[in-house]
Amino acid sequence: TPEVWVQVRMEATELSSFTIRCGFLGSGSISLVTVSWGGPNGAGGTTLAVLHPERGIRQWAPARQARWETQSSISLILEGSGASSPCANTTFCCKFASFPEGSWEACGSLPPSSDPGLSAPPTPAPILRAD
């Protein structure tokens, strides 16, 4: 069964800066990745970035840099201030569209006990939805 993992890290040097990393553990070919915050995309969440392996990358503030790390993982740097700044309990979600597995989505947030600059290991997060 495919799995999606989500890792959220707050940068020690900039407390309003977050790095989100997501990965897909499956054998299929990824056709689209959508990163959102505030909940799953389409269920109250707001899209931060969309990454298409053959067409490119689209991002919206406060996303600063979305990129592919490998064929099956992505990272996103967020920088914000004021209303557009993420906070420690913000939920980030990643949805991977893959053939032939379909769409798989998982969410994560900053570990409650983590200090800035520390992060939880990138273990698979609970799968919230598989279309």
Epitope: V50, L51, H52, P53, E54, R55, G56, I57, R58, Q59, Q65, R67, W68, T70, Q71
Partner: nanobody, 118 residues
């Protein structure tokens, strides 16, 4: 399918300048890496310069200080300002785009000829 169309090539004297442009058909997504390559007659295609959508730039040593690569993300357009041109810069210049930055799918333009001659 991303289409790339170059323009701006031509004949120029040594020491002169040219500005190449490359327009991409993709208007929704940013192309992660865009670059210029060139192929001189009888030689292999070689990298000239690349730029990511976040602005990271790379130049091959032979053009550093003479060529400037830039891009307009809003238009997904790529530019190459070429100054102090030399005879050895004569080549067909190709625009290249790697949307993911991973090389999974790479697109090429048809090329534009630059001739440096007196």
């Amino acid at each position: 399918e991303v289409q790339l169309v170059e323009s701006g090539g031509g004949l120029v004297q040594p020491g002169g300048s040219l500005r190449l442009s490359c327009a991409a058909s993709e208007t929704y997504f940013d192309l992660y890496v865009m670059g210029w390559y060139r192929q001189a007659p009888g030689k292999d295609r070689e990298l000239v310069a690349t730029i990511t959508y976040t602005g990271s730039i790379y130049y091959v040593d032979s053009v550093k200080g003479r060529f400037t690569i830039s891009r307009d993300n809003a238009k997904n357009s790529l530019y190459l300002q070429m100054n102090s041109l030399r005879a050895e810069d004569t080549a067909v210049y190709y625009c290249n785009a790697d949307p993911s930055g991973l090389g999974r799918k790479v697109y090429w333009g048809q090329g534009t000829m630059v001739t440096v001659s007196s």
